[in-house]
């Protein structure tokens, strides 16, 4: 065979700098918890122990390609491709294997494809119980007075970045599209950046190509949708390193624009401002329930 050996694009466990060297990777995923004793047992699945101030962190250095070639993981989640599955195994430090090529189908159909973590999709399984199927990152709250699917999506950390969605409505940020999708329990996709205009034909919004398969929710993906209809988040390119001071840079593929997802306690376009409201006791955000 003439198949090239080794890495085809740097998506393996190491960034170009290699293990133990000083690196500058566009997609460096570090586990949040310190690894006090960083060794082969505490930093597995392609992770590399890195010094981080006082402690050590298990760094998962994966520069994944974003071709949408879904695989079903042994944890029941669908991943954008096998690289994202491996990256998830590293990030969560648990074994995840490919159990099937193609998405995990626990039911007929699935969700919106845009979720919270890593700009990723929500879980692929629908969660069944008294509520019936809860989709689009909704969870069943059986303790609630009116049993229903509860949406705990928090969009407060996102900067202003208006988008036009497939339901014909304008939203102040892609996160709010996910929230609406969750609340309404229906698929709502991002059509384009900016508010909806009179020229937007709602009959065409969200319409899919004849040859394209319906795409299920994807876990731990940068969620670059490769068809023209939907603009989702993907990691920012290397030239935008440092764009977000205290937050995560996310790239909206369809519009080629960057957006910052701020860490708790920061706000502003580049997450450069301290959000003093975090210092005060704020009433808990009311759960949004779909009955």
């Amino acid at each position: 065979s003439n198949q090239p050996p080794g890495g085809g694009g740097g998506s393996g466990g190491d960034c170009p700098g290699g293990k133990g060297k000083s690196i500058n990777c566009s997609e460096l995923n570090v586990r949040e918890s310190d690894v006090r004793v960083c060794d082969e047992s505490s930093c597995k699945y392609g992770g590399v122990c890195k010094e981080d101030g006082d402690g050590l962190k298990c760094a998962c250095q994966f520069q994944c390609h974003t071709n949408y070639i879904p695989v079903c993981g042994s944890n029941g989640d669908t991943y954008q491709n096998e690289c994202f599955l491996r990256r998830a195994a590293c990030k969560h430090q648990k074994e995840i294997t490919v159990i099937a090529r193609g998405p995990c189908y626990s039911d007929n159909g699935s969700g919106s494809g845009e979720g919270e973590e890593e700009g990723s999709g929500a879980e692929v399984h629908r969660k069944h119980s008294k509520c019936g199927p809860c989709k689009y990152k909704a969870e069943c709250d059986e303790d609630a007075e009116n049993v229903g699917c509860v949406c705990n999506i928090d969009c407060s950390g996102y900067s202003f970045n208006p988008v036009c969605a497939s339901d014909g409505s304008s939203y102040n940020n892609p996160c709010f599209v996910r929230e609406a999708s969750c609340i309404k329990q229906e698929q709502i996709d991002i059509r384009h950046l900016g508010h909806c205009t009179d020229t937007d034909d709602t009959s065409l919004l969200g319409k899919k190509d004849d040859g394209l398969q319906y795409r299920p929710d994807v876990k731990d993906a940068s969620d670059q949708r490769e068809d023209v209809y939907i603009g989702n988040h993907m990691p920012c390119p290397e030239n935008l390193n440092g764009y977000c001071i205290h937050g995560k840079c996310e790239f909206i593929y369809s519009t080629q624009k960057a957006s910052c997802r701020c860490e708790s306690g920061y706000t502003g376009q580049h997450c450069e401002k301290t959000d003093f409201s975090i210092l005060y006791v704020v009433p808990s955000r009311q759960k949004l329930t779909h009955v």
Epitope: G8, G9, G10, S11, G12, N67, I69, E82, G211, Q256
Partner: antibody, heavy 121, light 107 residues
Framework: QVQLVESGGGVVQPGRSLRLSCAAS????????MHWVRQAPGKGLEWVAV????????FYIDSVKGRFIISRDNSKNTLFLQMNSLRAEDTAVYYC??????????????WGQGTLVTVSS | DIQMTQSPSSLSASVGDRVTITCRAS??????LAWYQQKPGKVPKLLIY???TLQSGVPSRFSGSGSGTDFSLTISSLRPEDVATYYC?????????FGQGTKVEIK
Amino acid sequence: QVQLVESGGGVVQPGRSLRLSCAASGFTFTTYGMHWVRQAPGKGLEWVAVVWFEGNSKFYIDSVKGRFIISRDNSKNTLFLQMNSLRAEDTAVYYCARANCGADCYPFDYWGQGTLVTVSS
Amino acid sequence: DIQMTQSPSSLSASVGDRVTITCRASQGISNYLAWYQQKPGKVPKLLIYAASTLQSGVPSRFSGSGSGTDFSLTISSLRPEDVATYYCQKYNSAPWTFGQGTKVEIK
């Protein structure tokens, strides 16, 4: 050895349809993404479409969306391109090519010899 | 979609010359870049993948470099058999766009 053999090209009138085939041999077909690439006479290469592995993921260049359908028959190790509503600008040599993408991704290491599609009235 | 821009569109050099072709992506593509050689009337042939990895069987006078948005293909000492059109291609995500090509001729 790896072989990709295209067929189905020919002269067709605008608005009509044509179905291209690519017979693959010498490798495990299901472990590769299969692509169509075209080259208009005297012009550069243009990627057209891909179908991955089991056929559950496929993508197209904008100019052929809604007109062309890529598919594969893994039991016969064959790739297809159904071309509908053909236009003069679809005139080109059409190549099939294989690419391996999984945990990592590789470009086209093998190409077919190409089949010429001429759209003319 | 990400655009791939090659320069120059054509060049003429002498046998033994060092030749460099550049390719620029409109957005970062990490090192998911390939270079192909297409001789007149022939099928394209993979030269370089992952921006800098030489494909098996390709002469060592060919080399690639770059990451992110800027890439280059270098022929360290041009040979008559290198007369061809060279294409770059991104493959990190669909569409797998090609550059417009660079035609290399011998003076």
